[in-house]
């Protein structure tokens, strides 16, 4: 029954991890706009992987596409690819745990099998959740230095009283989406490879004792007994409920309350 | 096609207070900024804040600060903007003007003079 | 605040010749993540209010003649009106469409000689 729920849940919390994977990858607010000098921006910008996007405070907003593969930074380059990595692997793994849930019967296949197939998947989970985290990290690391080299020269003299403010990018929410995500998935992972040792079937193999009763023989032959009694081959109505992300993206915000500027 | 009505003229005294009305149509109202820009006589254009109507929020110009008051009221598709503790200086033709792409402004209403005189 | 200082004060020139507004503001108006200037022109006939001509700096509003153009980038920015008709007697003003609070130019006056 353990291994049953730990599997199971082991399968819920990476299925969430990805489906917030894949969220992070797809938002366009890995960098926004510093505000910390200016909380109310007419003019507020947000960068993401794959497009950068200006929201004017009269609502109007507009993105444009890297359009390009030659002309961007190497670094950002990497953190896609660590994201679509984390991405692929962690669909693979969905697909290979599907099989190897314990309460789904495919055929006749071996406990050992699922065993194996449980700790494939746990790897790939494992695998792609540290490529999730890498690819956030390494893109809030770039933020961190990029921030404090504009911020030491934060406004450039033209011409003595003219002044040029130079936009800074903060930390953005698809960073901390990306960040609990590939936490979830790690941590699925590591519940499947823990519910692996459980289904990987024991290889002490019990003799048959017959007992002689007076008047006729019964033969008691002990078998194996599994933890999960219950959870084998009868799947009837029973439903497998799989968890999933949403995020809300390109949420059109306003100047708060009473703002004076 | 668009439309943005205003009230009619005022005098008032200094110290009162006043509030101008402006009436939007042919548009979706509360998708919309409605920003209030006013003009002394012979003077340029000065901004004194925005509204949303769609949730009510403001973004006022300091120089009001505590002095203006912006409400939106969507049954009527009408925004208002409300100046207080008058003084000589407020004498001017006020615009509601609504807010477009490009942080421009697009149509204007027709202006209401207010007069602050003693 | 951002200062936009405009020039000439007035303006006269004579019916189809090229007109020329300068606007200077005290701060870069170029957005880095479009690389557009928020600046934007208005022109007001007497006893009118205002009327967009110009916002993103060169964008002309729809309906706007296309012989009034704009030009310009960072904290320098001009309005061209290629060949002056009557009509285009008014006051320009431009605007400072990127920080808060939104400020204008004091207007120039543009008369027929």
């Known amino acids: 029954m353990a291994v049953t729920a730990c599997q199971g849940l082991g399968f819920v919390v990476s299925l969430i991890g990805i489906a917030g994977i894949i969220a992070a990858t797809c938002m366009d607010q890995w960098s926004t706009q510093d505000l910390y000098n200016n909380p109310v921006t007419a003019v507020f910008n947000y960068q993401g992987l794959w497009r950068s996007c200006v929201r004017e405070s009269s609502g109007f907003t507009e993105c444009r596409g890297y359009f390009t593969l030659l002309g961007l930074p190497a670094m950002l380059q990497a953190v896609r690819a660590l994201m679509i990595v984390g991405i692929v692997l962690g669909a693979i793994g969905l697909l290979v745990s599907i099989f190897a849930l314990k309460c789904i019967r495919i055929g006749s296949m071996e406990d050992s099998a699922k065993a194996n197939m449980t700790l494939t998947s746990g790897i790939m989970f494992i695998v792609s959740g540290l490529c999730a985290i890498a690819g956030v990290s390494v893109f809030a690391n770039m933020l961190v230095t990029n921030f404090w080299m504009s911020t030491a020269n934060m406004y450039t003299g033209m011409g003595g009283m003219v002044q040029t403010v130079q936009t800074r990018y903060t930390f953005g929410a698809a960073l901390f989406v990306g960040w609990v995500a590939g936490g979830l998935t790690l941590i699925g992972g590591v519940m499947m490879c823990i519910a692996c040792r459980g289904l990987a079937p024991e290889e002490t193999n019990y003799k048959a004792v017959s007992y002689h009763a007076s008047g006729h023989s019964v033969a008691y032959k002990p078998g194996g007994f599994k933890a999960s009694t219950g959870f084998g081959s009868n799947t009837k109505n029973k439903k497998i409920y799989d968890g999933g992300a949403r995020t809300e993206d390109e949420v059109q915000s306003y100047p708060s309350k009473h703002d004076y500027v | 096609q668009v439309q943005l009505v205003q009230s009619g003229a005022e005098v008032k005294k200094p110290g009162a207070s006043v509030k101008v009305s402006c009436k939007a149509s042919g548009y979706a109202f509360s998708s919309y900024w409605m920003n209030w820009v006013r003009q002394a006589p012979g003077q340029g254009l000065e901004w004194i804040g925005q509204i949303y109507p769609g949730n009510g929020d403001t973004t006022y110009n300091g120089k009001f600060k505590g002095r203006v008051t912006m409400t939106a009221d969507k049954s009527t598709s009408t925004v208002y903007m409300e100046l207080s503790s008058l003084r000589s200086e407020d004498t001017a033709v006020y615009y509601c003007?609504?807010?477009?792409?490009?942080?421009?402004?697009?149509?204007w209403g027709q202006g209401t003079l207010v007069t602050v005189s003693s | 605040d951002i200062v936009m200082t405009q020039s000439p004060d007035s303006l006269a020139v004579s019916l189809g010749e090229r007109a020329t507004i300068s606007c200077k503001s005290s701060?870069?108006?170029?957005?880095?993540?479009?690389?557009?200037?928020?600046l934007t022109w208005y022109q007001q006939k007497p006893g009118q209010p205002p009327k967009l001509l110009i916002y993103?700096?060169?964008t002309r509003e729809s309906g706007v003649p296309d012989r009034f153009s704009g030009s310009g980038s960072g904290i320098d920015f001009t309005l061209t009106i290629s060949s002056v008709q009557a009509e285009d007697v008014a006051v320009y003003y431009c605007q400072n469409a990127y920080s808060y609070p939104f400020t204008f130019g004091q207007g120039t006056k543009l008369e027929i000689k």
């Open positions: 701060q870069s108006l170029l957005n880095s993540g479009n690389q557009k200037n928020y």
């Open positions: 003007a609504r807010f477009v792409k490009g942080n421009a402004m697009d149509y």
């Open positions: 993103w700096a060169s």
